[in-house]
C-alpha cells in the first residue's frame, strides 16, 4: 500500500548491526509523485566500492547510490548526511554485511518523503504535444486554439477530418495552407460522386510540400489516396512525387493526410473532378459500332449492327442490330450478345429433285439441288447452285429465292422404236418405246401424257364418259398386267368448245376439234415406261410438209383382232387431205359428201396399209422435232378415218397449243405452281 | 422446353429481408442475362435489374440500388433477388425474365406481402 | 432515366374493332421499344420487339410501328381475349423502363 512518508533502519539500529545480513525495503508513494530519500546517519564498514558492507538505494533497474563508512551533516540546522531525489514513485533499499566486522558498527538511520514531481520539466520525453500543465501529484496537456486533445489525453490534433464531397468539380487542401500544417494530425477526406463517375484527382507539383522520408523510405508525414482496393501512396517529400493526373476509376474516393510531431511544410492542395466512367471499345467480332468513337464513356449508347450474313439470335427469333450503353460500372450492356453466322437451316425439298445434306447452312454455305435425271430437268434454269445469304435465305444467281422446279423431260423415249417383223399395218412396241402413250379401257382408246397433271386425247373419247379410267407404264393392256401398271384418276375433262356435241355420236360427220384435255387428281410419277410427250411449237418449224413421218402407237383394232392386247406401233408419212377425202368410207352412216374435212385435220398412212384404227383413237400421232432430234412432239391426235389401213385423220395439235396452255394454266393447283 | 419457376409467396415483416428464386430449365442461364421485375398491386412493371450469370456482372435501376441484390448460381441454373429492409412498399409481385434482345420469357412471379 | 409514357391508362373498344395505343419517350431510343401483353392473373407476354417486329406466334392482328420518341401499338381486328393491359418499354438503355400500361377493355 503506498504511504506518503517512512522510516528505514538497519538491523539492531542503534546497536551494531550483525554480520551477513541481507535487508531490503521497498518503498512505495503514491502515482504522481516522486521520493525523497534522505539519511540521519549513517555508520557502516568503510571498504572500497563499498564491497564489504553497504546501503544501496535502486530505482527501477537503475543503481541510484551506495553508500559505506561515516558520515556527517555540513549543515548545523540539519541532520541530513546524504539525500536522494527520484522522480519515479517506487523505490528499493537493501542493506548488506559480510561475515566480520573490524570495529562495532551502528548502521544508518534514513526516511523518505512523497514529494511533487514536475512531469513537465523532470522528464527527457515531453508528456505533452503542445502545453503541459503541472500540478501536486499529476499533470495535464493543454492545446492551442483550433487543436483538439486526442483520446490519450497527451497529444493534440486539428479536427479536419469528416468533410464529403459530392460536387463533380473540386478543390482540397491541407489545413492552414499554405502555412505549415498541423503536427500529430491525422485528416480524412471523402469524395462520393454519381455512379458512373470517376473520381480523378490532378496535382501540380509546386502545390505539394511535406515532410521527407526517413532514411528507410518511409514517409514520416504523408499523402495516401484510397479508391476501393486501390491505393495510391503513400506521398511525401518536397514537389509532388507521384503522377500529376491520377484517375481512380472508381467513383468513391478517400484522402488520408498523416502528421507526426515534428517538421512541419506548407502541405498540399489539390483539384479533383468526375469524368464519365470509360468503357473499353470492345472488339466485337463481325458489326460495326455507330457512333464510332475513340473514347467511350458512361451513359454512351452505340448501335452495334452485324454484318452481313450476322445475326443476334433470340430463341427462334434474329436480328441484326441491338444497342448496347456504356454504364456506371464501366461495362457494357448486352455484351453478351455476339453476332454469329445466319443460319439458312435444313434446305427445303423439291419434288422430282433432290438437294444433298449440306456440310454446314451457316452463311456463305452452298448447296446444288439436283433433277432426277434423265425424267426430270430443272425448268427455271440458274443451276440448281443455292448459297446461305443475309438474310437467312438459300438464294440462287437467277431466281433468288426461288426453288428450282424440276418438270418431267418431255418427248425422248428411253428405248428408240425400231420396226421388226412385219406385222399385218405395224409392229409390236413397248411402252419404252412411247412411254407418253395412256391407255383409256371405256371407251378403249388412248391418249398422250403432256406433262404430270395433264392428258391430251380426242374429244370423241371423253365425251361419253367425263370419268375414265386411265393406265400408264404397261406394254399389255391384259387385266392382269393393268393391276400392275399406274392407274390414273381424272379431276376433270376439258372437252375444246369448237367440238360439237350431238345427241347421237354414232352418226358424226364432223370430226373439227376433236381435241380433250384431262386433268389428273395427283401428279404423275415420271420413268423408264413413264414420260410425257412434248407439245409442238408455235413457229413455221412445226407445220408439217408432205411425206414427213410419224409415229402412232396403241391397242387398237389390228388385222387379226378387234383389239390388241400388247403395244403397237406404225411409222406413217403425212399425205395431202385430198388423200383422205378420196377413200371410200367404209360403213358410212351418212351421205360420202357429209363428211367434213378441215385445216385443223392432217392426213397420214396410205403405206403398205399402215394406219391407226378404232381404238387407238386420241394416241399423238409423234413427229421428230426439227430444232431436237432426240425429241418427239405431238403433231397429232388420233382422230377418224375412212377406213382402216388406207389414210387416217389426226387432229393438228398445233392449232391447239394456245388453248391447250390457257386451259392448263387456269385450272392448275397451287401443288403445281 | 424454356421454362422459369418461382419460388413460392411470402410474407414477411417489416425491417426483415427475403430471397427469391427463380430456377431455369430448358437453356443455361450463362448465355442470357436474367432480369427481376416488380409489379405493385394494380400498378405498372418496374424493371430493378439484371445480373450475368457468366461473371456475377450486376446492374440496377438507381432506385432500387441498396433495396435489391441480384445474385445466381450458375451449377443449380439458378438466379436470386434479395430485398432487404422490407417496408409495405416492397409488397408486389417480382418476376424474373430471361433476355438477350429483349424479356422473351418470364416466371410465373412470387408474391410478397411485408405485413407486422 | 428514360420516361416511357403511355397517354391513356384505359380504352374501351368492341370485337371487331381497330384499336392502337400510343407510347412516347422521353428521348431518342431508336426503335429499341417492345410492347408487352399482360392478362390478368399472369405474366407479361412479348407481343413486338425492335418497334415493329412480330413475336414467334404472335397473330398478324398486333403490329407496331415507330422509332425515335413516338410509338404505336395497334391491334386491327380486336378478339375478346385481347382483355389485357398493354406495357411498352425501352431497351435502348439501362434502366430499362416501362410505360405505365394502357388497360383495354371489351364493351
Known amino acids: 500500500e503506498p504511504t506518503m512518508y517512512g522510516e528505514i533502519l538497519s538491523p539492531n539500529y542503534p546497536q551494531a548491526y550483525p554480520s551477513e545480513v541481507e535487508k531490503s525495503w521497498d518503498i512505495e508513494v503514491p502515482e504522481g509523485y516522486g521520493i525523497h530519500l534522505y539519511f540521519t546517519h549513517l555508520d557502516i564498514e568503510l571498504s572500497e566500492n563499498c564491497a564489504y558492507d553497504s546501503v544501496q538505494i535502486i530505482s527501477g533497474d537503475t543503481e541510484e547510490g551506495r553508500l559505506c563508512g561515516q558520515r556527517s551533516s555540513n549543515n548545523p540546522h540539519s541532520p541530513i548526511v546524504e539525500e536522494f531525489q527520484v522522480p519515479y514513485n517506487k523505490l528499493q533499499v537493501i542493506f548488506k554485511s559480510d561475515f566480520s566486522n573490524e570495529e562495532r558498527f551502528t548502521g544508518f538511520a534514513a526516511y523518505y518523503v512523497a514529494t511533487d514531481i514536475n512531469e513537465c520539466t523532470d522528464f527527457v520525453d515531453v508528456p505533452c504535444s503542445h502545453f503541459c500543465n503541472n500540478f501536486i501529484g499529476g499533470y495535464f496537456c493543454s492545446c492551442p486554439p483550433e487543436y483538439f486533445l486526442h483520446d490519450d489525453m497527451k497529444n493534440c490534433g486539428v479536427n479536419c477530418s469528416g468533410d464529403v464531397f459530392t460536387a463533380l468539380i473540386g478543390e482540397i487542401a491541407s489545413p492552414n495552407y499554405p502555412k505549415p500544417y498541423p503536427e500529430n494530425s491525422r485528416c480524412e477526406y471523402q469524395i462520393r460522386l454519381e455512379k458512373g463517375f470517376q473520381v480523378v484527382v490532378t496535382l501540380r507539383r509546386e502545390d505539394f510540400d511535406v515532410e521527407a522520408a526517413d532514411s528507410a523510405g518511409n514517409c514520416l508525414d504523408s499523402l495516401v489516396f484510397v479508391a476501393g482496393d486501390r491505393q495510391f501512396g503513400p506521398y511525401c517529400g518536397h514537389g509532388f512525387p507521384g503522377p500529376l493526373n491520377i484517375e481512380t476509376k472508381s467513383n468513391a474516393l478517400d484522402i488520408i493526410f498523416q502528421t507526426d510531431l515534428t517538421g512541419q511544410k506548407k502541405g498540399w492542395k489539390l483539384r479533383y473532378h468526375g469524368d464519365p466512367m470509360p468503357c473499353p471499345k470492345e472488339d466485337t467480332p463481325n458489326s460495326v459500332w455507330e457512333p464510332a468513337k475513340a473514347k467511350y464513356v458512361f451513359r454512351d449508347v452505340v448501335q452495334i449492327t452485324c454484318l452481313d450474313g450476322f445475326e443476334v439470335v433470340e430463341g427462334r427469333v434474329g436480328a441484326t442490330s441491338f444497342y448496347s450503353t456504356c454504364q456506371s460500372n464501366g461495362k457494357w450492356s448486352n455484351s453478351k450478345l455476339k453476332c454469329q453466322p445466319v443460319d439458312c437451316g435444313i434446305p427445303e425439298s423439291i419434288e422430282n429433285g433432290k438437294v444433298e445434306d449440306p456440310e454446314s447452312t451457316l452463311f456463305g454455305s452452298v448447296i446444288r439441288y439436283t433433277c432426277e435425271e434423265p425424267y426430270y430437268y430443272m425448268e427455271n434454269g440458274g443451276g440448281g447452285e443455292y448459297h446461305c445469304a443475309g438474310n437467312g435465305s438459300w438464294v440462287n444467281e437467277v431466281l433468288g429465292p426461288e426453288l428450282p422446279k424440276c418438270v418431267p423431260v418431255c418427248g425422248v423415249p428411253r428405248e428408240p422404236f425400231e420396226e421388226k417383223q412385219r406385222i399385218i399395218g405395224g409392229s409390236d412396241a413397248d411402252i419404252k418405246n412411247f412411254p407418253w402413250q395412256v391407255f383409256f379401257d371405256n371407251p378403249w382408246a388412248g391418249g398422250a401424257l403432256i406433262n404430270e397433271y395433264w392428258v391430251l386425247t380426242a374429244a370423241h373419247v371423253v365425251e361419253g364418259n367425263r370419268e375414265p379410267t386411265m393406265y400408264v407404264g404397261s406394254t399389255s393392256v391384259q387385266t392382269s398386267r393393268l393391276a400392275k401398271s399406274k392407274m390414273l384418276t381424272p379431276e376433270h375433262v376439258f372437252i375444246h368448245p369448237g367440238w360439237k356435241l350431238l345427241e347421237v355420236p354414232e352418226g358424226r360427220t364432223n370430226f373439227d376439234n376433236d381435241i380433250a384435255l384431262v386433268r389428273l387428281k395427283d401428279p404423275v410419277k415420271m420413268g423408264p415406261t413413264v414420260s410425257p410427250i412434248c407439245l409442238p411449237g408455235t413457229s413455221s418449224d412445226y407445220n408439217l410438209m408432205d411425206g414427213d413421218l410419224g409415229l402412232i402407237s396403241g391397242w387398237g383394232r389390228t388385222e387379226k383382232r378387234d383389239r390388241a392386247v400388247r403395244l403397237k406401233a406404225a411409222r406413217l408419212p403425212v399425205a395431202p387431205l385430198r388423200k383422205c377425202k378420196e377413200v371410200k368410207v367404209e360403213k358410212p352412216t351418212a351421205d360420202a359428201e357429209a363428211y367434213v374435212f378441215t385445216p385443223n385435220m392432217i392426213c397420214a398412212g396410205g403405206e403398205k396399209g399402215m394406219d391407226s384404227c378404232k381404238g387407238d383413237s386420241g394416241g399423238a400421232f409423234a413427229v421428230q422435232d426439227p430444232n431436237d432430234k432426240t425429241k418427239f412432239y405431238a403433231a397429232g391426235l388420233v382422230s377418224w378415218g375412212p377406213q382402216c389401213g388406207t389414210y387416217g385423220l389426226y387432229t393438228r395439235v398445233k392449232n391447239y397449243v394456245d388453248w391447250i396452255m390457257k386451259t392448263m394454266q387456269e385450272n392448275s393447283t397451287p401443288r403445281e405452281d | 422446353e424454356v421454362q422459369l419457376q418461382q419460388s413460392g409467396a411470402e410474407l414477411v415483416r417489416p425491417g426483415a429481408l427475403v430471397k427469391l428464386s427463380c430456377k431455369a430449365s430448358?437453356?443455361?442461364?450463362?448465355?442470357?442475362?436474367m432480369h427481376w421485375v416488380k409489379q405493385r398491386p394494380e400498378q405498372g412493371l418496374e424493371w430493378i435489374g439484371w445480373i450475368d450469370p457468366e461473371n456475377g456482372d450486376t446492374i440496377y435501376d438507381p432506385k432500387f440500388q441498396g433495396k435489391a441484390s441480384i445474385t445466381a448460381d450458375t451449377s443449380s441454373n439458378t438466379a436470386y433477388l434479395q430485398l432487404s429492409s422490407l417496408t409495405s412498399e416492397d409488397t408486389a409481385v417480382y418476376y424474373c425474365?430471361?433476355?438477350?434482345?429483349?424479356?422473351?420469357?418470364w416466371g410465373q412471379g412470387t408474391l410478397v406481402t411485408v405485413s407486422a | 432515366d428514360i420516361v416511357m409514357t403511355q397517354s391513356h391508362k384505359f380504352m374501351s373498344t368492341s370485337v371487331g374493332d381497330r384499336v392502337s395505343f400510343t407510347c412516347k419517350a422521353s428521348q431518342d431510343v431508336r426503335t429499341a421499344v417492345d410492347w408487352y401483353q399482360q392478362k390478368p392473373g399472369q405474366s407479361p407476354k412479348l407481343l413486338i420487339y425492335s418497334a415493329s417486329y412480330r413475336y414467334t406466334g404472335v397473330p398478324d392482328r398486333f403490329t407496331g410501328t415507330g422509332s425515335g420518341t413516338d410509338f404505336t401499338f395497334t391491334i386491327s381486328s380486336v378478339q375478346a381475349e385481347d382483355l389485357a393491359v398493354y406495357f411498352c418499354q425501352q431497351q435502348y438503355t439501362t434502366p430499362y423502363t416501362f410505360g405505365g400500361g394502357t388497360k383495354l377493355e371489351i364493351k
Open positions: 425474365a430471361r433476355s438477350r434482345l429483349f424479356f422473351a420469357y
Open positions: 430448358g437453356f443455361n442461364i450463362k448465355e442470357y442475362y
